[in-house]
């Protein structure tokens, strides 16, 4: 490929790094649906944005392929639990891509945050963060879900969320 | 812009891309001051360090507008706990910006982690991590808060820190 | 240096940028030795990549100097605890330098999961993620260390892992 | 300025149960810890327990399990403790104690309740 | 539990002199640098009073010539110089394990 070449694609990617793909989805009222499927999130409101990324029913889609490190936060808490002290919260990333049927994990967190209220009416509060660098093709989706999604708990925004960015 | 306007820029951004905005600040004995403002850190020594980003008074200052990951670990720990098992921790990272009078949240977490004393031995550790992208301006300073802060344990740097990153 | 030389450079940079160093490395069967060593790592199977950096017993090494943001997450769990309810378990990024014969601390967590499980019989699951950014020289390597490694949990990958993108 | 005032001195048979409190004044009543500590005649002091205001969570000492119990009226800034089935290993002078702002000591302490058990 | 042992039991200072009380426990009281020993006075008719906490901080007014030293098991109250109304039973306290235990005492009496 020739200087002109080499040129334009010098100009093409000064371009695309202006824009080198980002997004921070913020929890909201509607996050929880309880019907099993993943976690929805805010686009646009306050601190939520996307930059070279889209959104699709609670999915985070890559349009340009590459390492993405991606990450999520979901704020836990409850007055006592629903299963007691047994009761296990696991977090996860998951894609979904058109080359497979099923979900695949990605980043996964299990926490037993109710062994810290020992009787039925112990407030508590926990927290859980994932983060890791995985590779997206355009086309392929991130999304979040959380198995008990009843101990999630919502606000503002700031407390649970669900983010990429290219590295 | 002519071929001579994009050599430049591309001049420019190459000389940027080197310093791409980095920080990442260290605990340390003078960290807690109990006085309610944020927290204060290291900024130098050790595994200190600023690259295009100022520090003042327990804020990282943004030079450069852009989206940058923040984040933040707390070291939590003690024997036992001021309010039992009723105490909540809350850590969170803040901006603080001219066009606004108050700080406002970006990033927050709450625990219970005096759950974790539960036996006559009544020393506990725990760890908070926050991090997520966000859009800043230049001159907008990021803080980190923990309240309680008399139960945030800081020994070397490496258990306690906050940082950022463009993207 | 002339336009020739800033030519070069710019393609260079351009080369350099698409191959931006970055791995994630994910928990196996062999990661725990329980020889008091590192815990080591899948680096091709699955999630797992090495993109301008390289491994060995467990560390990534550097092959380009650089600012990085290193992570590592584990998971905790078991059904009671080694030492009974005062059980601290730390997690830890660790630097080796040919110009240092010790480890140097670059990232902890203690944490003390035991709490959740108030008998000795108690079923309980915790989960520690650490990141941050550290400078590290061509040469230099990173591990992770966890004590007790004993309550450190693997099944797939997605639990435990371990990774570094440059900043 | 804070203020831990003790109920007056109490004299009780051997199998009753008596209960003494402590109102305290001067600070916010539900940010520190109670403390109970029991002192014998010629002897040491010996910790019974803890009661945490804000929730009325409490910790026993185990040689004080089923002897004492702690309970909370945060509409008075009140502890009570009730010691029952007293015997003559029980008459003392118990006195409440404060948690320190770091939790970990006794700060302000009441002016102790005399207990006497006489048949 | 853990036991706390003050030596001496009592103990006869004269008038501006340097009284010095040991505590020894039976385990460490070390966390994370900090050692949970606190030191208390009593006198006949009173309550006790917190004089030191975790191990060397001298507690809101408290005179300076009252200092504790010491970490892990080994904990001193030094007193200097002494004066008339020092003269009390002082007491060792350690809370990093449940149950709080306190030292048997140690009666200064002032020459």
């Known amino acids: 490929d020739g200087p002109a070449g080499s040129w334009e694609q010098l100009i093409q990617e000064r371009r695309s790094h202006e824009v080198n793909p980002a997004a921070h989805l913020t929890g909201a009222n509607s996050s929880l649906t309880g019907s099993g499927g993943p976690l929805l999130w805010e686009t646009q409101l306050g601190l939520a944005f996307l930059r070279g990324l889209s959104y699709h029913d609670g999915a985070l889609v890559v349009t340009k392929a590459g390492y993405y490190y991606i990450y999520s936060k979901v704020q836990l808490g409850g007055v006592g639990c629903p299963l007691g002290l047994a009761s296990t919260i696991t977090h996860g990333l998951y894609k979904r891509t058109p080359r497979y049927p099923e979900e695949l994990e990605l980043l996964v967190s299990q926490q037993s945050p109710c062994g810290r209220a020992t009787s039925s009416s112990r407030v508590w509060w926990d927290s859980s963060f994932l983060g890791g660098v995985v590779h997206l093709e355009a086309g392929e989706e991130v999304v979040v879900r959380v198995l008990d999604e009843r101990l999630v708990r919502l606000r503002d925004g700031t407390r649970s969320y669900f983010g990429a960015f290219m590295v | 812009d002519g071929p001579a306007g994009s050599w430049e820029q591309l001049i420019q951004e190459r000389r940027s891309h080197e310093v791409n905005p980095a920080a990442h600040l260290t605990g340390a004995n003078s960290s807690l001051t109990g006085s309610g403002g944020p927290l204060l850190w290291e900024t130098q020594l050790g595994l200190a360090f600023l690259r295009g980003l100022s520090y003042h008074d327990g804020a990282l200052v943004v030079t450069k507008a852009g989206y940058y990951y923040i984040y933040s670990k707390v070291q939590l720990g003690g024997v036992g706990c001021p309010l039992g098992l009723a105490s909540t921790i809350t850590h969170g990272l803040y901006k603080r910006t001219p066009r606004y009078p108050e700080e406002l949240e970006l990033l927050v977490s709450q625990q219970s982690p005096c759950g974790r004393a539960t036996s006559s031995s009544r020393v506990w550790w725990d760890s908070s991590f926050l991090g997520g992208v966000v859009h800043l301006e230049a001159g907008e300073e990021v803080v980190v808060r923990v309240l309680d802060e008399r139960l945030v344990r800081l020994r070397d740097g490496t258990r306690s820190y906050f940082g950022a990153f463009m993207v | 240096d002339g336009p020739a030389g800033s030519w070069e450079q710019l393609i260079q940079e351009r080369r350099s940028h698409e191959v931006n160093p970055a791995a994630h490395l994910t928990g196996a069967n062999s990661s725990l030795t329980g020889s008091g060593g590192p815990l080591l790592w899948e680096t091709q199977l699955g999630l797992a990549f090495l993109r301008g950096l390289s491994y060995h017993d467990g560390a990534l090494v550097v092959t380009k100097a650089g600012y990085y943001y290193i992570y590592s997450k584990v998971q905790l769990g078991g059904v009671g605890c080694p030492l009974g309810l005062a059980s601290t378990i730390t997690h830890g990024l660790y630097k080796r330098t040919p110009r240092y014969p010790e480890e140097l601390e670059l990232l902890v967590s203690q944490q003390s999961p035991c709490g959740r499980a108030t008998s000795s019989s108690r079923v309980w699951w915790d989960s520690s993620f650490l990141g941050g950014v550290v400078h590290l020289e061509a040469g230099e390597e990173v591990v992770v260390r966890v004590l007790d490694e004993r309550l450190v949990r693997l099944r797939d990958g997605t639990r435990s892992y371990f990774g570094a993108f440059m900043v | 300025q804070v203020q831990l005032q003790q109920s007056g001195a109490e004299m009780a048979s051997p199998g009753a149960s008596v209960t003494l409190s402590c109102k305290a004044s001067g600070y916010t009543f539900i940010d520190h810890i109670m403390n109970w500590v029991k002192k014998r005649p010629g002897q040491g002091l010996e910790w019974i327990g803890r009661i945490y205001p804000v929730s009325g969570e409490t910790n026993y000492n185990q040689k004080f399990m089923g002897k004492a119990t702690f309970s909370v009226d945060r509409s008075s800034s009140t502890v009570y403790m009730v010691l029952n089935s007293l015997t003559s290993e029980d008459p003392a002078v118990y006195y409440c104690?404060?948690?320190?702002?770091?939790?970990?000591?006794?700060?302000?302490w009441g002016q102790g309740t005399t207990l006497t058990v006489s048949s | 539990d853990i036991v706390m042992t003050q030596s001496p039991a009592s103990l006869a200072v004269s008038l501006g002199q340097r009284a010095t009380i040991s505590c020894k426990a039976s385990?460490?009281?070390?966390?994370?640098?900090?050692?949970?020993m606190n030191w208390y006075q009593q006198k006949p008719g009173q309550p006790p009073k917190l004089l030191i906490y975790s191990a060397s901080n001298l507690e809101s007014g408290i005179p300076a010539r009252f200092s504790g030293s010491g970490s892990g098991t080994d904990f001193t109250l030094n007193i200097h110089p002494v004066e008339e109304e020092d003269a009390a039973t002082y007491y060792c306290q350690q809370s990093i394990e449940d149950p709080w235990t306190f030292g048997g005492g140690t009666k200064l009496e002032i020459k």
């Open positions: 104690g404060r948690g320190s702002y770091y939790w970990n000591a006794m700060d302000y």
């Open positions: 385990q460490s009281v070390d966390f994370d640098g900090d050692s949970y």
